[in-house]
Interface confidence: low
Amino acid sequence: SGTTNTVAAYNLTWKSTNFKTILEWEPKPINQVYTVQISTKSGDWKSKCFYTADTECDLTDEIVKDVKQTYLARVFSYPAGHVESTGSTEEPPYENSPEFTPYLETNLGQPTIQSFEQVGTKVNVTVQDEWTLVRRNDTFLSLRDVFGKDLIYTLYYWKSSSSGKKTAKTNTNEFLIDVDKGENYCFSVQAVIPSRRTANRKSTDSPVECMGHEKGESRETGHHHHHH
């Protein structure tokens, strides 16, 4: 059964990065509005984005309650100007989303190199820890807090004067690498969850940062450019 002149939503798609999670769908509404419901496999449905003309709904607040749960959403279609009627027994058309498990499926956002510091022939490169909207005891958690050792960072580094890249990895947010004295190096990092096997295993590469520019500090030269 369906409600007159309404079309069921379709192409329900989860868009999620660092747990910021939005459900998108089609079509753009003509004379209809949507309401979204979300639940865990064993939980009750909770309604969100009531009677919206948008084709997206931010469900972050719901999924961050337990990022390891599996969620299902559904989008109901109502006639434009719909006012909930207690007398209506006809179920509006709706479409279910794919299942979504945030911990496994959220994309890793592009990381940022926070700073680098050279001491002799060693360089310490620090990756900025991104904050998420996941909370524990009313405190927002960082990406590292949520993923722990499941999250590693890969550092790509190369001499400014050459194209040969080297790599290092860490399961903290810091790298300590050996460099040749007197050479400038460039750096880029990538967030990785090795235990994932899907396309969302890796983030995009961070912007490239190079020694001799505004990001680092060198005890040899006395330049201090800390980025926060």
Partner: antibody, heavy 124, light 108 residues
Framework: QVQLQQWGAGLLKPSETLSLTCAVY????????WSWIRQPPGKGLEWIGE???????RYNPSLKSRVTISVDTSKNQFSLKLSSVTAADTAVYYC??????????????????WGKGTTVTVSS | EIVLTQSPGTLSLSPGERATLSCRAS???????LAWYQQKPGQAPRLLIY???SRANGIPDRFSGSGSGTDFTLTISRLEPEDFAVYYC?????????FGGGTKVEIK
């Protein structure tokens, strides 16, 4: 050192459900995949499926309709259920840890820790 | 499904000889996902090589892996008595993960 200890019924009748459990000692479920593999008598190895610590599963399509792999992180163990068994399911069943390993720009997956195997016979 | 075909099915050699085992894939396999295992009667398989060419912990350097794409090779440079066993290649990049049919290395 991580060890896998597995157990379950060894003799089943056709149409029954095979149920095996594998306990992980000396290590965590987290960060790995956990696989089941079987080997019919005198034959080669067949991958049945795997589960991640968070519950994500992948199954061999040839068995998918009959297989359920689950994980119990509180007990540090994972389990295999195979429904509607026939004589063709007679095999030694192994559990194994499937390790994702990063080294110098590459990701490698390999089964580095195995259980000793459980012989399962299906016979009327 | 990626089919892995191992050859020869049986290799009869003497201790001290060199063993060359082949694994051919029906479709290209990322070498990161290609592994070799050794299995002795009544025992579980044991990881020898991962990533097509990296030796697992505790594996002697007489074992080496090579190859890429659809053709991979396990070489045992000098067979020791304990090396006589069945060897399987495996790909873990595409579901279903598949094993080759095995090569039995037996004493001549």
């Amino acid at each position: 050192q991580v060890q896998l200890q597995q157990w379950g019924a060894g003799l089943l009748k056709p149409s029954e459900t095979l149920s095996l459990t594998c306990a992980v000692y000396g290590g965590s479920l987290s960060g790995y995949y956990w696989s089941w593999i079987r080997q019919p008598p005198g034959k080669g190895l067949e991958w049945i499926g795997e589960i991640g610590a968070s519950g994500s599963t992948r199954y061999n399509p040839s068995l998918k309709s009959r297989v359920t792999i689950s994980v119990d992180t509180s007990k540090n163990q994972f389990s295999l259920k195979l429904s509607s068994v026939t004589a063709a399911d007679t095999a030694v069943y192994y559990c194994a840890r499937d390790t994702p390993y990063y080294y110098e720009g590459g990701y490698y997956y390999y089964m580095d820790v195995w259980g000793k195997g459980t012989t399962v016979t299906v016979s009327s | 499904e990626i089919v892995l075909t191992q050859s020869p099915g049986t290799l009869s050699l003497s201790p001290g000889e060199r063993a060359t085992l082949s694994c051919r894939a029906s479709d290209s396999v990322d070498s990161s996902y290609l592994a070799w295992y050794q299995q002795k009667p009544g025992q579980a398989p044991r990881l020898l090589i991962y990533g097509a060419f990296s030796r697992a912990n505790g594996i002697p350097d007489r074992f080496s892996g090579s190859g890429s794409g659809t053709d991979f090779t396990l070489t045992i440079s000098r067979l020791e008595p304990e090396d006589f066993a069945v060897y399987y290649c495996q790909q873990a990049g595409v579901v279903p993960y598949t094993f080759g049919g095995g090569t039995k290395v037996e004493i001549k």
